[in-house]
């Protein structure tokens, strides 16, 4: 995966929120649920209020890039989603508030929002050829591709 | 199904310690925090701690920081909590309960232990 | 910490009854608040989460609705059943704090 030097000198400026308390599906129809603290995993469920909620802010590019940038927030929280290493879960870091300028090491913060049709995804900015991605009997990771699911339905206003 | 079963009940001396397990099944022990709550004869519910049941972090409530201690055995999916330095205070049922977040931010206890009964006296 | 005062601490009332409890945080808990049930020499059941929703199984006599810093549980036509003691809980953050309970009786 790429190191997180790599796009150092690029700078994100928050926008705005572009979705509010949406839920991720993955293609096995798992959602993604919160579990022990900081670990996001997934789950089949009876009951869809288990389904973390989230909250999506996007990102404006100094370079201009034709991707859409988002920072994923759970809804109601000040927690937000951040990438590691490939294999790694990835972990919920707690933030007094959006942060409005995001450059350098922080990049693991954000992710480029690709759609195909109803399938969602989500790459690490800090590292470009990794997907936020579910996995059998694991944490919601970020992955290369499978076995790992990288493909997600946003489901909205779910009451 | 998910069961929390926990041991049975326990007579001990002041200033002794005594270790509870908690049992669980149903579901992937290690997905879900578990809870230790514990209630005086004829009181409320008192919240005790938790303990990451990925990590083996705990958390415990300031009535008893130093006092308890959570383990965990996840060969086994059993969850240990053990309070020393009893006294006649101590008196109570001690619950186990396992954690839930709903929509990721708001925490509940959906399953609990059928509770062990721990008396102390001389 | 969020401390949880709930009232009253005791209520008597007759079958078919409205029973109404109250909960009140001191400090906003963005609608994080639940409610169980216990009943004598019983483990505690989770009855309502997140304020207003029903745990599954959970009849519909029972609901709950509030914001900020107060809570009400509500019991829309009281059963014999019901007899036993209601706790609310915050679950904004550590530690996670219960009400003292309210005991409930029929008359």
């Known amino acids: 995966s790429a190191p997180f030097s790599f796009l150092s000198n690029v700078k994100y400026n928050f926008m705005r929120i572009i979705k509010y308390e949406f839920i991720l599906n993955d293609a096995l129809n798992q959602s993604i649920i919160r579990a022990n603290d900081q670990y996001l995993t997934a789950a089949a469920l009876h009951n869809l209020d288990e389904a973390v909620k989230f909250d999506m802010g996007a990102y404006k590019s100094s370079k201009d890039d034709a991707k859409i940038t988002v920072i994923l927030r759970i809804s109601k929280t000040q927690l937000y989603v951040t990438a590691q290493d490939e294999d790694q879960p990835v972990l919920l870091k707690e933030m007094p508030e959006i942060p409005k300028t995001i450059t350098g090491s922080e990049t693991n913060l954000l992710f480029f929002w690709e759609t195909h049709g109803t399938k969602n995804y989500f790459t690490s900015v800090a590292h470009p050829n990794l997907f936020i991605a579910t996995k059998q009997d694991y944490w919601v990771c970020l992955a290369g591709g499978p076995p790992s699911i990288t493909d997600f339905q946003i489901l909205e206003n779910q009451a | 199904e998910v069961q929390l079963v926990q041991s049975g009940a326990e007579v001990k001396k002041p200033g002794v310690s005594v270790k509870v397990s908690c049992k669980a099944s149903?579901?992937?022990?290690?997905?879900?925090?578990m809870h230790w709550v514990r209630q005086a004869p004829g009181q409320g519910l008192e919240w005790m701690g938790w303990?990451?049941?990925?990590?083996?972090?705990?958390t415990y409530a300031d009535d008893f920081q130093g006092r308890v201690t959570f383990t965990l055995d996840t060969s086994t999916s059993t969850a240990y909590m053990e309070l020393s330095s009893l006294r006649s205070e101590d008196t109570a049922v001690y619950f186990c309960?396992?954690?839930?977040?709903?929509?990721?931010?708001?925490?509940?206890?959906?399953?609990w232990g059928q509770g062990t009964t721990v008396t102390v006296s001389s | 910490d969020i401390q949880m005062t709930q009232s009253p601490s005791s209520l008597s009332a007759s079958v078919g009854d409205r029973v109404t409890i109250t909960c009140r945080a001191s400090?906003?808990?963005?609608?994080?608040l639940n409610w169980y049930q216990q009943k004598p020499g019983k483990t505690p059941k989770l009855l309502i989460y997140?304020?207003?929703r029903l745990y599954p199984g959970v009849p519909s006599r029972f609901s709950g609705s509030g914001s900020g810093t107060d809570y009400t549980f509500t019991i829309s036509s009281l059963q014999p059943e019901d007899i036993a003691t209601y706790f609310c809980?915050?679950?904004?953050?550590?530690?996670?704090?219960f009400g003292q309970g309210t005991k409930l009786e029929i008359k």
């Open positions: 309960a396992r954690g839930i977040y709903y929509y990721g931010s708001s925490y509940a206890m959906n399953y």
């Open positions: 149903g579901y992937t022990f290690t997905t879900y925090g």
């Open positions: 303990i990451n049941t990925y990590t083996g972090e705990s």
């Open positions: 400090q906003d808990i963005s609608n994080m």
């Open positions: 997140y304020t207003s």
């Open positions: 809980q915050q679950g904004k953050t550590l530690p996670y704090a």
